[in-house]
C-alpha cells in the first residue's frame, strides 16, 4: 500500500476518502484506526455501524466521525476541529471476523493557521509539497457533517 | 541508539543570517516530525515550529514567522533552520528535537544545541 | 496562545524526600503536556508525555498527574541525579509552548 497524504489546517475540518472495492468489501464494517508507532497495532479509532446494512449512517468517536457508502465504494472519514495531536499515521481498515484488511494507509498533517493575525493580508491555504516523491497528497479541508444529517442517505 | 547531532557555534553580525543543521541517527529520518526550539540565556524554551520529513510540510510559531525558515534533505537525512536578519534577540541556543511517529506528541530526544551569538 | 504557569520556579530538597512541581495552563489541553528535565552537558530528558505516561527508561520515581488545565510531576525519593531544572510543555495547540521552568536544587 501506497501512503495518501492529507493536510488540514489546525481548527478546521479534515475529510479522509478511502475508495474500496464494494463487491469485494461486501457485508464488512469497516474501521479506522491509528498507529502510533513503527511496532505495535493498530489501535481503533472508530468503526461503521454495528449493522452493515446501516453504515451509511454516522458514528462519532469525538471529534472523529465515519460513514460508509457501501454501494460507490468509498469509506469517509471527517476528523473536526483539527489539532495538531491529530496528526499521524492511520489505516482504513475492512473487517471480517478478527482480521483487518488495510484498504488505505493515510498520512494526516495538521498543519499551523498560517494566516498571521496581526497581518492578515497574507493569507495561505496548503498546496502540494514539492518535496516528496512517493506520496499523494489531498488537501481536504471541509465543514464536518451536521449532528443527524445523512451523508449518503439509502437509494430506494 | 538515537542521536541528533547540531552544528557548531556561530558568531554573526547583525542583519546577517545563518543556517544551522541537524543530522539525526539511529532512526528512519522520514517517519519523525522534527522540531526547533530557542533558549536565549537564562530563560525558557521556545517552540519555533515543526517540519514533517516526509512531506516537507511545516508549522510555525508565529512569532517566528519571517525569522526561521525550516527545510529538510532526504537524501542526507539532515533538518536545516536559516535564521535571517539577525539581532542581538536572536543569541540564544537553538535546539532541534525530534517529535513522535509522524505526530508531535512530546519531544523524545534532543540536540546537544547550537549557539548563536549576534555582535557586531 | 496557551500559557503554562509552573510553580515552583525554585525548590531545594533533600535526597529521599518527595517533591511535586505544577504546571496550570491558561485553557484546557485535556491530556496533552509533556515533562522535561534539563541538565548542563547533557541533552534534554522527556519524562512524561501525555500527562501521566512515563517514558521507558525513565525511573518509577517520576510519575505525572492531572488533566484539563492542572498538572502535576511528581519525584518520590529523590535521587542526587535529580537535581535539574524542569519544564513542563503543551502540545494540545499551535504554537507549543513551555513552562518558565522549576529549579530543583539540592538543600
Known amino acids: 500500500h501506497n501512503t495518501t497524504v492529507f493536510q488540514g489546517v489546525e481548527g478546521q475540518s479534515l475529510q479522509v476518502s478511502c475508495p474500496y472495492d464494494s463487491m469485494k468489501h461486501w457485508g464488512r464494517r469497516k474501521a479506522w484506526c491509528r498507529q502510533l508507532g513503527e511496532k505495535g497495532p493498530c489501535q481503533r479509532v472508530v468503526s461503521t455501524h454495528n449493522l452493515w446494512l446501516l453504515s451509511f449512517l454516522r458514528r462519532r468517536n469525538g471529534s472523529t466521525a465515519i460513514t460508509d457508502d457501501t454501494l460507490g465504494g468509498t469509506l469517509t472519514i471527517t476528523l473536526r476541529n483539527l489539532q495538531p495531536h491529530d496528526a499521524g499515521f492511520y489505516q482504513c481498515q475492512s473487517l471480517h471476523g478478527s482480521e483487518a484488511d488495510t484498504l488505505r494507509k493515510v498520512l494526516v498533517e495538521v498543519l499551523a493557521d498560517p494566516l498571521d493575525h496581526r497581518d492578515a493580508g497574507d493569507l495561505w491555504v496548503p498546496g502540494e509539497s514539492e518535496s516528496f516523491e512517493d506520496a499523494h497528497v489531498e488537501h481536504s479541508i471541509s465543514r464536518s457533517l451536521l449532528e443527524g444529517e445523512i451523508p449518503f442517505p439509502p437509494t430506494s | 541508539e538515537v542521536q541528533l547531532q547540531q552544528s557548531g557555534p556561530v558568531l554573526v553580525k547583525p542583519g546577517a543570517s545563518v543556517r544551522m543543521s541537524c543530522k539525526p541517527s539511529g532512526y528512519t529520518f522520514t517517519d519523525y516530525y522534527m522540531n526547533w526550539v530557542k533558549q536565549s540565556h537564562g530563560k525558557s524554551l521556545e517552540w519555533i515550529g515543526s517540519i514533517n520529513p516526509y512531506t516537507g510540510g511545516s508549522s510555525y510559531n508565529q512569532n517566528f514567522r519571517g525569522k526561521a525558515t525550516l527545510t529538510v534533505d532526504k537524501s542526507s537525512s539532515t533538518a536545516y533552520m536559516e535564521l535571517n536578519s539577525l539581532t542581538s534577540e536572536d543569541s540564544a541556543v537553538y535546539y532541534c528535537?525530534?517529535?513522535?511517529?509522524?505526530?508531535?506528541?512530546?519531544?523524545?530526544?534532543w540536540g546537544q544545541g547550537t549557539l548563536v551569538t549576534v555582535s557586531a | 496562545d496557551v500559557q503554562l504557569t509552573q510553580s515552583p520556579s525554585f525548590l531545594t530538597a533533600s535526597p529521599g524526600e518527595t517533591i511535586t512541581i505544577n504546571c496550570r495552563a491558561s485553557?484546557?489541553?485535556?491530556?496533552?503536556l509533556a515533562w522535561y528535565q534539563e541538565k548542563p552537558g547533557k541533552t534534554n530528558k522527556l519524562l512524561i508525555s501525555s500527562g501521566s505516561t512515563l517514558q521507558s527508561g525513565i525511573p518509577s520515581r517520576f510519575s505525572g498527574s492531572g488533566s484539563g488545565t492542572d498538572f502535576t510531576l511528581t519525584i518520590s525519593s529523590l535521587e542526587p541525579e535529580d537535581f535539574a531544572m524542569y519544564y513542563c510543555?503543551?502540545?494540545?495547540?499551535?504554537?507549543?509552548?513551555f513552562g518558565s521552568g522549576t529549579k530543583l536544587e539540592i538543600k
Open positions: 510543555q503543551q502540545y494540545s495547540e499551535y504554537p507549543f509552548t
Open positions: 528535537a525530534r517529535g513522535s511517529y509522524y505526530s508531535n506528541l512530546g519531544f523524545a530526544y
Open positions: 485553557k484546557s489541553i485535556s491530556k496533552y
